[in-house]
C-alpha cells in the first residue's frame, strides 16, 4: 500500500468560450481508495478555489459553468490525489479559455455541381458556422477545412478554405459519387469534428480541369 501516483491534467476544452471542462489522468492508486480534487486560482489572485462541478464532464473531470468562466484570465490549476498513505499533486496547468475552444462542426453543408456555359464546371460547397460561436463580436476567427473523396476511395482529398464559408473545386472524377465534409477551428484552438457527410453525384459529362 502506497501513496497515490502523480495525476496529470491532460486536456481542457470549451465549446464557445462561455464554459469549459478539464480532464485528468489518475496516477497509480497505491492499492487504496483515492480521492481527487482539483483546485485553481486565477492569474493575479492568491485565493484558491475548488472545482465547482465534478459531475458534468464525467469521471476525472472538472466543469466550469458560465459563472466560473472568465475570458482573458489565465487559470492555474492542479489536481490533488489523496489516500490513507498520503497525497500527490499534478503539475500546475495554465489555462486560457480563449485558446481551448473546440467548436461544434459547421452546419448546413450544401454541395452542388455548377456547369456554367462559358466556363469549366465545378463543385460548389457552402456551409454555415456552428450556432454556439458568435462571430459578430470579433472574438472568433474560424478557419475551415473541407475533405472529399469518391464513395469507394480510401484517401481523402483535403482543401483549406481559410475564413470563407464557400469553396469551389474543379478537379473531380466524372460519374463518381462523392462524400463531402467540412470542419472548423478557431485561429487558436482545436478542430471540430467533421460535419455529417453530404453526398453528391458528379455527372458523367463533368469535364476534368486541365
Amino acid at each position: 500500500q502506497l501513496p497515490p501516483g502523480k495525476p496529470e491534467i491532460f486536456k481542457c476544452r470549451s465549446p464557445n468560450k462561455e464554459t469549459f471542462t478539464c480532464w485528468w489522468r489518475p496516477g497509480t492508486d497505491g492499492g487504496l481508495p483515492t480521492n481527487y480534487s482539483l483546485t485553481y486560482h486565477r492569474e493575479g489572485e492568491t485565493l484558491m478555489h475548488e472545482c465547482p462541478d465534478y459531475i458534468t464532464g464525467g469521471p476525472n473531470s472538472c466543469h466550469f459553468g458560465k459563472q466560473y468562466t472568465s475570458m482573458w484570465r489565465t487559470y492555474i490549476m492542479m489536481v490533488n490525489a489523496t489516500n490513507q498513505m498520503g497525497s500527490s499533486f499534478s503539475d500546475e496547468l495554465y489555462v486560457d479559455v480563449t485558446y481551448i475552444v473546440q467548436p461544434d462542426p459547421p452546419l448546413e453543408l450544401a454541395v452542388e455541381v455548377k456547369q456554367p456555359e462559358d466556363r469549366k464546371p465545378y463543385l460548389w460547397i457552402k456551409w454555415s458556422p456552428p450556432t454556439l460561436i458568435d462571430l459578430k463580436t470579433g472574438w472568433f476567427t474560424l478557419l475551415y477545412e473541407i475533405r472529399l473523396k469518391p464513395e469507394k476511395a480510401a484517401e481523402w482529398e483535403i482543401h483549406f478554405a481559410g475564413q470563407q464559408t464557400e469553396f469551389k473545386i474543379l478537379s473531380l472524377h466524372p460519374g463518381q459519387k462523392y462524400l463531402v465534409q467540412v470542419r472548423c477551428k478557431p485561429d487558436h484552438g482545436y478542430w471540430s469534428a467533421w460535419s455529417p457527410a453530404t453526398f453528391i453525384q458528379i455527372p458523367s459529362d463533368f469535364t476534368m480541369n486541365d
Epitope: D91, Y99, Y190
Partner: antibody, heavy 120, light 107 residues
Framework: EVQLVQSGAEVKKPGSSVKVSCKAS????????MHWVRQAPGQGLEWMGE????????NYNQKFKDRVTITADKSTSTAYMELSSLRSEDTAVYYC?????????????WGQGTLVTVSS | DIQMTQSPSSVSASVGDRVTITCKAS??????VAWYQQKPGKAPKLLIY???NRYTGVPSRFSGSGSGTDFTLTISSLQPEDFATYYC?????????FGGGTKVEIK
C-alpha cells in the same frame, strides 16, 4: 519530470538540409504546442514556428516559411524541425520549447539546444 | 513584425543592487509579454508571463510591470546567480519576437 531531449550537433554544407528532433517526456505530448527558436552565436532569440501535436497544425515565421517544416510524431512523442537550403547565416543553436500552458505562446520548458554549423 | 527594443544592452551591477531592464514594443501588445533569463551555454528559463506574473518557482525578487508598449523587468536585490542575459518576448501577434537581450554583468 518534464524533459525535452534534442538530437546532437550537426555540421552541414550550404544548400543542404538539416532535421533536428526533440523527444518529449514527463507529460502528455499532445496537450501542448511545441515551438522552435534559434540563436545565432552571440545573438538573440528568433522564433521559427510552432506545431500543435494533437493534429499537426502548424504556424511559421514568414521569414522561414519556404524553408522550414515542423512535424510531430505522436507515437514517439517527438517533434521535428527541418530547415532546407542552408546558408552560413543559419549557423545557430536550435531549441525546441514547450508552450507554458493551454494558452498564449510563452515557453516554460526548453530543450538543451542543438548546434547546427553550416560550413563549406 | 513587432520589434521589441531592450535597454540597456548591458548593465554592470553588484550583489544587492536593484536592476531595472526595459523593453519597448513597436506597437501595442497589451500585456502579452514574457521575460526569460539565459546563462551562457544554457537554454533560456521563463521568469515572467503576461507582463507581470511570476512563473512557478521564480524568486519574488523578480517582478515585471507594464502594458501597451512599455515593459519593465526588475530584480529587487541582485543575487550572484542572477548574472545572466535577460530577454523580453511578445506573443501578441505573429511572428512571436524577442528583444535583443540585456546582459547583467558583475561590477
Amino acid at each position: 519530470e518534464v524533459q525535452l531531449v534534442q538530437s546532437g550537433a550537426e555540421v552541414k554544407k550550404p544548400g543542404s538540409s538539416v532535421k533536428v528532433s526533440c523527444k518529449a517526456s514527463g507529460y502528455t505530448f499532445t496537450t501542448y504546442w511545441m515551438h522552435w527558436v534559434r540563436q545565432a552565436p552571440g545573438q538573440g532569440l528568433e522564433w521559427m514556428g510552432e506545431i500543435d501535436p494533437s493534429d499537426s497544425y502548424s504556424n511559421y515565421n514568414q521569414k522561414f516559411k519556404d524553408r522550414v517544416t515542423i512535424t510531430a510524431d505522436k507515437s514517439t512523442s517527438t517533434a521535428y524541425m527541418e530547415l532546407s537550403s542552408l546558408r552560413s547565416e543559419d549557423t545557430a543553436v536550435y531549441y525546441c520549447a514547450r508552450n507554458g500552458g493551454l494558452g498564449p505562446a510563452w515557453f516554460s520548458y526548453w530543450g538543451q539546444g542543438t548546434l547546427v554549423t553550416v560550413s563549406s | 513584425d513587432i520589434q521589441m527594443t531592450q535597454s540597456p544592452s548591458s548593465v554592470s551591477a553588484s550583489v544587492g543592487d536593484r536592476v531595472t531592464i526595459t523593453c519597448k514594443a513597436s506597437q501595442y501588445v497589451g500585456t502579452a509579454v514574457a521575460w526569460y533569463q539565459q546563462k551562457p551555454g544554457k537554454a533560456p528559463k521563463l521568469l515572467i508571463y503576461s507582463a507581470s506574473n511570476r512563473y512557478t518557482g521564480v524568486p519574488s525578487r523578480f517582478s515585471g510591470s507594464g502594458s501597451g508598449t512599455d515593459f519593465t523587468l526588475t530584480i529587487s536585490s541582485l543575487q550572484p546567480e542572477d548574472f545572466a542575459t535577460y530577454y523580453c518576448q511578445q506573443y501578441s501577434s505573429y511572428p512571436w519576437t524577442f528583444g535583443g537581450g540585456t546582459k547583467v554583468e558583475i561590477k
